[in-house]
């Protein structure tokens, strides 16, 4: 379950089953959300383009202690080929825009659903 960044990148990308599992997990998060997700933590917005998985992980990895997104962090880590640590930032972040984790998850989910519908997973 590794890739060289995002769907627009050359090389291996997550197969359809892995993408479907990530989508299902994000759906689960949005549907089961009661209190503010991750206590309303804010994360950097990202460009949903090439290198999306690593950029998403770089953003979400700065959220600690949020059990709701632990599995998502694990999955994104599996999709990103390089080591990502908290406090690490790439040019893929929209560095002047922070959004709530809940909104980040919704945006990511919408984008992944679109890619899945278009068959962009192999």
């Amino acid at each position: 379950l590794t890739c060289l960044g995002g769907f627009a990148s050359p090389g291996p990308v997550p197969p359809s089953t892995a993408l479907r599992e990530l989508i299902e997990e994000l759906v689960n998060i949005t549907q089961n959300q009661k209190a503010p997700l991750c206590n309303g933590s804010m994360v950097w917005s990202i460009n949903l383009t090439a290198g999306m998985y690593c950029a998403a992980l770089e953003s979400l990895i700065n959220v600690s202690g949020c059990s709701a997104i632990e599995k998502t962090q694990r999955m994104l880590s599996g999709f990103c080929p390089h080591k990502v640590s908290a406090g690490q930032f790439s040019s893929l972040h929209v560095r002047d825009t922070k959004i709530e984790v809940a909104q980040f998850v919704k945006d990511l989910l919408l984008h992944l659903k679109k890619l899945f519908r278009e068959g962009q997973f192999n």
Partner: antibody, heavy 118, light 111 residues
Framework: QVQLKESGPGLVAPSQSLSITCTVS????????INWVRQPPGKGLEWLGM???????DYNSVLKSRLSISKDSSKSQVFLKMNSLQADDTARYYC????????????WGQGTSVTVSS | NIVLTQSPASLAVSLGQRATIFCRAS??????????MHWYQQKSGQPPKLLIY???NLESGVPARFSGSGSRTDFTLTIDPVEADDAATFYC?????????FGGGTKLEIK
């Protein structure tokens, strides 16, 4: 800087309950997970349970019926309560904070020693 | 529950030599391409200290003499070369599944 400090009764009579407080500083409990780990004298480490920043609580299934973990984020305190103590519960009890993903236990308190004896 | 079995229970290594500690899990601790196995060092009278996370990543501030390897069920902690200050008990720990579990520990003595 990150600090954790456990405080407990020291001595507990058999069949009684144990209450330990972990008071933290240098970070917020709303965005951090706190674990409870114990270590009997001369023995290894045993994970008791944890409370996530968002409130979820996970317990060691073997001890779940005797354990209760809670917190008061506004006071920066995490609480461990254990019922029906016996001699083999004698141990040093640690609280430890997870780091960021992948949630290994990065920061530890010095621990508090608990002896179960009449 | 995932049971972690460490070997040997104790070992004595000469100063400057290599120490190798093993940890075997009763089932895989891998998830999405990562191994959720961590290593700690505990010196006498002190709390444990994280050395290695995700099987092979060195925690900040830990000397490069420490290294970790392995995947799925078999993991290794290596100290090379061993220094006098390394005398301690070392524990592996998994958090791939709840409950989190520790290995029984390996006591390292420096000769």
């Amino acid at each position: 800087q990150v600090q954790l400090k456990e405080s407990g009764p020291g001595l507990v009579a058999p069949s009684q309950s144990l209450s330990i407080t972990c008071t933290v500083s240098g970070f917020s409990l709303t965005g951090s997970s706190i674990n409870w780990v114990r270590q009997p004298p001369g023995k290894g480490l045993e994970w008791l349970g944890m409370i996530w920043g968002d409130g979820r609580i996970d317990y060691n299934s073997v001890l779940k019926s005797r354990l209760s973990i809670s917190k008061d984020s506004s006071k920066s305190q995490v609480f461990l309560k254990m019922n029906s103590l016996q001699a083999d519960d004698t141990a040093r009890y640690y609280c430890a904070r997870d780091g960021y993903y992948p949630y290994a236990m990065v920061y530890w308190g010095q621990g508090t020693s608990v002896t179960v004896s009449s | 529950n995932i049971v972690l079995t460490q070997s040997p229970a104790s070992l004595a290594v000469s100063l400057g030599q290599r120490a190798t500690i093993f940890c075997r899990a009763s089932e895989s601790v891998d998830s999405y391409g990562n191994s959720f196995m961590h290593w700690y060092q505990q010196k006498s009278g002190q709390p444990p200290k994280l050395l290695i996370y995700l099987a092979s990543n060195l925690e900040s501030g830990v000397p490069a003499r420490f290294s970790g390897s392995g995947s799925r069920t078999d993991f290794t902690l290596t100290i090379d070369p061993v220094e006098a200050d390394d005398a301690a008990t070392f524990y592996c720990q998994q958090n791939n599944e709840n409950p989190r579990t520790f290995g029984g520990g390996t006591k390292l003595e420096i000769k």
